[in-house]
């Protein structure tokens, strides 16, 4: 904590002294007080030193030292009394402005501290203080006026004893404002509307705010509405609402209207759209792609849109096939409404098995028709793969068959030794298939292609892997002759369940 | 270290309100004296006023009856609105803390403030 | 207009010693201490000298004030290009009761 020297909390001292006061820190150090021309400041090392050497009743005041660089912000005061004879007050301020509530300060400041016994806080002219003003006085400060009232805002004068007759401070100006948060509160309902030519509609724009002095108007596309105002008052709030009829609307009615309310503190807008249209609609519409593939045991969130007017009379999400009859649980169809006019319905599709792959489609109705929207959901499988030894036209041949989605594509390697799988080190030839043969391909369901690979003699202390992979993953089968008979192996890792 | 910030239009219509907010961080408000500085494009800097954080204000005579300004202790702002604006209000209007000799130790960086219809 | 008189430019070469000078009057720099600022280009004011001849910390020591009846002066030395700038006087004034602003000069490094 800084200190100040002279160490005393108050100095009195008479017109024309020299005044120095110098306040010493750890580090550099900061004087905060009234703004005044009758001081010089000069630092001189870790003190600042503050001085006059012909002090007036104006250097009257609380002089406070800091530490800027004090975390705990530690701080010295001392308080100067020029005591003047013909000035008793030393008033800070022309204008003290609080908001409603708050205790408003009034500062003028006693000279000579021997005069606080007759002083009093008046109005200008004479003029006692309003009733129930609770006010109080500190010499170092001045008048404090407590929980200050809109009504309390008036012209004040200090006045003071002084052999017998009371000396008036210059005037304060108070201004107790009262407190408006900001522009008023603005609701405009609903928030869009659409309605067919010939119904009715109704906007509402209604504003409230702590202080009866605010404006309100409703405008459509930038042209004034002359509609009838209706005020209230509840909740402390001043309220004033404007309601637009319309019986039978019409195209022209259609566009942006705008619920405008200002005050003193500034300007609040908010905007919504009505459309007028020719009859009922119904539009269905999916931010996704609706050819979705997903991989086997994965799951699936079906999203559709739907914009509608008038609301929806039905909807449902139906499984279309090919694999079953079942249809989507209800449990897992859900619809959140984003606006009066636009909902959106998901279907959750978690843990997807085989038998759900095909079509799903999601069908509304409302007084404009039905209309449907249908997605096509396709399933990924890694490859399965089998190795056969078989003859065709006499010649030896692996056969080797594969079945996954997307099609996989075979490669064949031969290696030394018998092995489950080929690993580099043993791989002796490898053989890509880039065109197998397709054995079947129906939508939705897994594509199976066969590849041969003709072998004139089977060496056997080999293996023959056939090979097959796509974006899922892959798998594999090791064929391995031996002098009884083939064998044939599967990997381990091949057990698959979807 | 404290640092102040101005807000609020940048254009005001004439014969409106020009509104302006000081926002201080890095110190409390408390304690001090707050000052409003303008100065039109290419001219020189012109005292508007000064306020105390109890609300106490002093003002530039050629600007007394269109000034009031205003403090937030609980929001560490204090504010300048000034009435009945015309071009000549044009100007980038600075906050500064005013120290004990009148010197202005800490300035906002200026907000822009045109007035036109 | 200011009731303060500033030259509205001077110049100088980088190295040499420069001086701005604040005519006033007996209600301002004649009673009271002068402060001086410094706005570089498309910046706000900053604290040069306050108190009549007092650097805040941070402001180099070529710069320093010095006052004199109702005149007062700011010396550069050792100007930079850095220098390049406006700088105002503001010295309290008893009858506006807050700090007046002289006009300006505009320092250029050539």
């Known amino acids: 904590i800084p200190v100040i020297e002279p160490s005393v909390p108050e100095l009195v001292v008479k017109p024309g002294a020299t005044v120095t006061l110098r306040c010493v820190g750890n580090g550099s150090v900061e004087w905060d007080g009234p703004p005044s021309p009758h001081w010089t400041l000069y630092s001189d090392g870790s003190s600042s030193i503050l001085s006059t050497n012909n002090a007036t009743f104006q250097n009257t005041g609380t002089y406070r030292c800091t530490e800027p660089g004090d975390p705990l912000g530690g701080s010295a005061a001392i308080h100067l009394y020029v005591k003047d004879p013909a000035r008793p007050w030393n008033v800070l301020a022309q204008e003290v402005v609080v908001f409603e509530d708050q205790d408003a300060l009034l500062p003028c400041l006693l000279t000579d501290p021997v005069l606080e016994a007759g002083v009093s806080l008046v109005r200008v002219r004479g003029r006692p203080l309003m009733r129930h003003t609770n006010y109080s006085f500190s010499p170092w400060h001045g008048f404090t006026i407590h929980r200050a009232k809109f009504i309390q805002s008036q012209d004040y004068q200090c006045s003071a004893l002084m052999g017998g007759r009371k000396v008036m401070s210059i005037s304060i100006r108070l201004k107790v404002q009262k407190v408006i948060p900001g522009p008023p509160a603005l609701t405009l309902v609903p928030a869009e509307l659409v309605r067919i030519r010939g119904e009715a509609a109704q906007i509402v724009c209604s504003a409230s705010s702590v202080d009866v002095n605010f404006d309100v108007f409703l405008q459509h596309n930038n042209t004034k509405l002359a509609i009838p105002q209706q005020s209230d008052f509840h909740n402390n709030r001043y309220q004033k609402v404007l309601t637009l009829n319309l019986d039978q609307v019409d195209f022209q009615h259609a566009g942006n209207y705008s619920c405008v309310a200002s005050n003193v503190q500034g300007k609040h807008s908010t905007s919504m759209f009505f459309r007028v249209v020719e009859s009922a609609y119904l539009n269905l519409s999916s931010e996704q792609n609706l050819i979705q593939e997903v991989t086997v045991g994965e799951g699936l969130n079906l999203k559709v849109m739907v914009e509608a007017y008038p609301g929806l009379q039905g909807f449902n999400w139906t499984y279309l096939g090919p694999f079953s009859d079942h249809q989507p649980e209800p449990k897992l169809a859900n619809a959140t409404t984003k606006d009066t006019y636009r909902h959106t319905f998901t279907l959750s599709l978690p843990r997807l098995k085989p038998s759900e792959a095909g079509r799903y489609s999601f069908l509304a109705r409302n007084p404009g028709g039905w209309r449907a929207l249908t997605f096509e959901l396709t399933l990924r499988y890694p490859p399965e793969v089998s190795v056969i030894w078989t003859f065709i036209n006499g010649s030896g041949t692996l056969l080797c068959a594969a079945s996954g989605y997307p099609q996989p594509n075979v490669t064949w390697l031969q290696c030394s030794g018998h092995t489950d799988r080929c690993d580099e080190a043993q791989v002796l030839q490898v053989w890509d298939d880039p065109y197998p043969e397709v054995l079947s391909q129906e939508p939705f369901h897994k594509v199976t292609v066969q590849s041969l690979l003709t072998v004139e003699t089977l060496e056997h202390n080999q293996t023959y892997e056939c090979r097959a992979h796509n974006s899922v993953g892959s798998g594999s089968w090791a064929f391995i002759p031996i002098s009884a008979g083939a064998h044939t192996h599967p990997p381990d890792e091949f057990l698959f369940t979807p | 270290q404290v640092q102040l910030q101005e807000s609020g239009p940048g254009l005001v219509k004439p014969s409106e309100t020009l509104s302006l907010t000081c926002t201080v961080s890095g110190g409390s408000i408390s304690s001090n004296y707050w000052s409003w500085i303008r100065q039109p494009a290419g001219k020189g800097l012109e005292w508007i006023g000064r306020?105390?954080?109890?609300?106490?204000?002093k003002y530039n005579p050629s600007l007394k009856s269109r000034v009031t300004m205003s403090v937030d202790t609980s929001k560490n702002q204090f504010s300048l609105k000034l009435s009945s604006v015309t071009a000549a209000d044009t100007a980038v209007y600075y906050c500064a803390r005013e120290g004990i000799v009148g010197a202005f130790h800490y300035w906002g960086q200026g907000a822009l403030v045109t007035v036109s219809s | 207009q200011s009731v303060l008189t500033q030259p509205p430019s001077a110049s100088g070469t980088p190295g040499q010693r420069v001086t701005i000078s604040c005519s006033g009057s007996?209600?301002?720099?004649?009673?009271?201490?002068v402060n001086w600022y410094q706005q570089l280009p498309g910046t706000a004011p900053k604290l040069l000298i306050y108190?009549?001849?007092q650097r805040p910390s941070g402001v180099p020591d070529r710069f320093s004030g010095s006052k004199s009846g109702t005149s007062a002066s700011l010396a550069i030395s050792g100007l930079q290009s850095e220098d390049e700038a406006d700088y105002y006087c503001a010295p309290w004034d008893d009858s506006l009761n807050g700090v007046v602003f002289g006009g300006g000069t505009k320092l250029t490094v050539l």
């Open positions: 007996s209600s301002n720099i004649g009673s009271n201490t």
């Open positions: 108190s009549n001849n």
């Open positions: 306020i105390y954080t109890s609300g106490s204000t």
